[in-house]
């Protein structure tokens, strides 16, 4: 079952799916001046069996000015534009994608791919949020949103994440700014879809990246 809406937006935050549930579709979008090849797929589809999942179909783009089809080539790093919120950059991913049955990895880029990836998520999909550079989270723990089915309708849970800029902080004389201690982090509230391993990795990220302190949904 496809999720009706996109994951919720949070001010000054981006989200990313660390793995994609079977049934997820990714539109084959091309950058300006290019289009899908005539017989090309409209989308890639995450499919699989109990032991292995992968993306069916391949996206291929060709110049709008020519009739020739282009072969699918992975662009060089400098050619890869920053993608939209579903592709947030981080030094390590909170989930070992290969270890999640029924999920696909991030699809590799294709030549002349659009700068934004448009995914169609399915019920049960989880996305993780982090504050954009220059903003910090007011909460601690993993920030996630899950697409759930309730009373026959799909909805995304609201991630408990507030990202604030340093310039907004109000500190006054005599009010000392405490230092966040990386030690003794209490266990986050658990979610049925987050494993201990996920959270440990996320807290490691939090310790190394001020702007990527993930936070958990408040139930």
């Amino acid at each position: 079952e496809l999720c009706d809406d996109d994951p919720p937006e949070i001010p000054h935050a981006t989200f990313k799916a660390m793995a994609y549930k079977e049934g997820t579709m990714l539109n084959c979008e091309c950058k300006r001046g290019f289009r899908r090849i005539k017989s090309g797929s409209l989308y890639m589809l995450c499919t699989g069996n109990s032991s292995h999942s992968s993306w069916d179909n391949q996206c291929q783009c060709t110049s709008s000015a020519t009739r020739n089809t282009t072969k699918q080539v992975t662009p060089q790093p400098e050619e890869q534009k920053e993608r939209k919120t579903t592709e947030m950059q981080s030094p390590m991913q909170p989930v070992d994608q290969a270890s999640l049955p029924g999920h696909c990895r991030e699809p590799p880029p294709w030549e002349n791919e659009a700068t934004e990836r448009i995914y169609h998520f399915v019920v049960g999909q989880m996305v993780y949020y982090q504050c954009v550079q220059g903003y910090r989270a007011l909460h601690r723990g993993p920030a996630e949103s899950v697409c759930k089915m309730t009373h026959g309708k799909t909805r995304w849970t609201q991630p408990q994440l507030i990202c604030t800029g340093e310039m907004e902080t109000s500190q006054f004389p005599g009010e000392e700014k405490p230092q966040a201690s990386p030690e003794g982090r209490p266990e986050s509230e658990t979610s049925c879809l987050v494993t201990t391993t996920d959270f440990q990795i996320q807290t490691e990220m939090a310790a190394t990246m001020e702007t990527s302190i993930f936070t958990t949904e408040y139930q």
Epitope: P8, P11, A137, G141, Q158
Partner: antibody
């Protein structure tokens, strides 16, 4: 089940101080941002102050900046609001709240009356 | 600070009526808007977040729409328990700000 219980309200003269407390239970207090919201009698709602999970970031409404201080004691699961140089316009019910993005849990509120 | 202006400030309606309350922001707040319901002597209760997402447990007769600076809360068929004061609130930037409220009364 989340429970937030405010205390410390009362009648105070202009220019004096008061400290409000909010005892929290039913969730991992030290993981969550907390806030104070107030509502003057018969009036609307106003965010007063917000504090991050570890107390390292604090945000205040312009109307209370320099007079009010929000703080927390994670070991005691308690949120505080130190109110100095109180004015008549600070008269309100003060609510402690958390779950700032996902539905907000509120306390029952404590009434602060500033009057001579 | 971003000012939030609600209209009307009060309105009378009957059970079964369709009611619309509007909220205007002094500058764009994207879709970062909440709607609350408050009854006398009680803390506010959030009905809608992100302009149009229904809070869990809130009846589907409540809906929200809009973007940028203009937003609406609609109650499709008023029920007796819906008579209360409604507030919009932006969370695009601190300080978060509320509208002045709309008091919904029984006609």
């Amino acid at each position: 089940q989340v429970q937030l219980v405010e205390s410390g309200g009362g009648v105070v003269q202009p220019g004096r101080s008061l400290r409000l407390s909010c005892a929290a239970s039913g969730f991992t207090f030290s993981n969550h941002a907390m806030a104070w919201v107030r509502q003057a009698p018969g009036k609307g709602l106003e965010w007063v102050a917000v504090i991050s999970y570890d107390g390292s970031n604090k945000y205040y409404a312009d109307s209370v900046k320099g007079r009010f201080t929000i703080s927390r004691d994670n070991a005691k699961n308690t949120l505080y609001l130190q109110m100095n140089s109180l004015r008549a316009e600070d008269t309100a019910v003060y609510y402690c709240t958390t779950g700032l993005n996902s539905g907000y849990d509120w306390g029952q509120g404590t009434l602060v009356t500033v009057s001579s | 600070d971003i000012q939030m202006t609600q209209s009307p400030s009060s309105l009378s309606a009957s059970v079964g009526d369709r009611v619309t309350i509007t909220c205007r922001a002094s500058q764009s707040i994207n879709s970062f808007l909440n709607w609350y319901q408050q009854k006398p002597g009680k803390a506010p209760r959030r009905l809608i977040y992100g302009t149009n997402s229904l809070q869990s447990g809130v009846p589907s007769r409540f809906s929200g729409s809009g973007s940028g600076t203009d937003f609406t809360l609609t109650i499709s068929s008023l029920q007796p328990e819906d008579f209360a004061t409604y507030y919009c609130q932006q969370y695009n930037s601190w300080p978060w700000t509320f509208g002045q409220g709309t008091k919904l009364e029984i006609k």
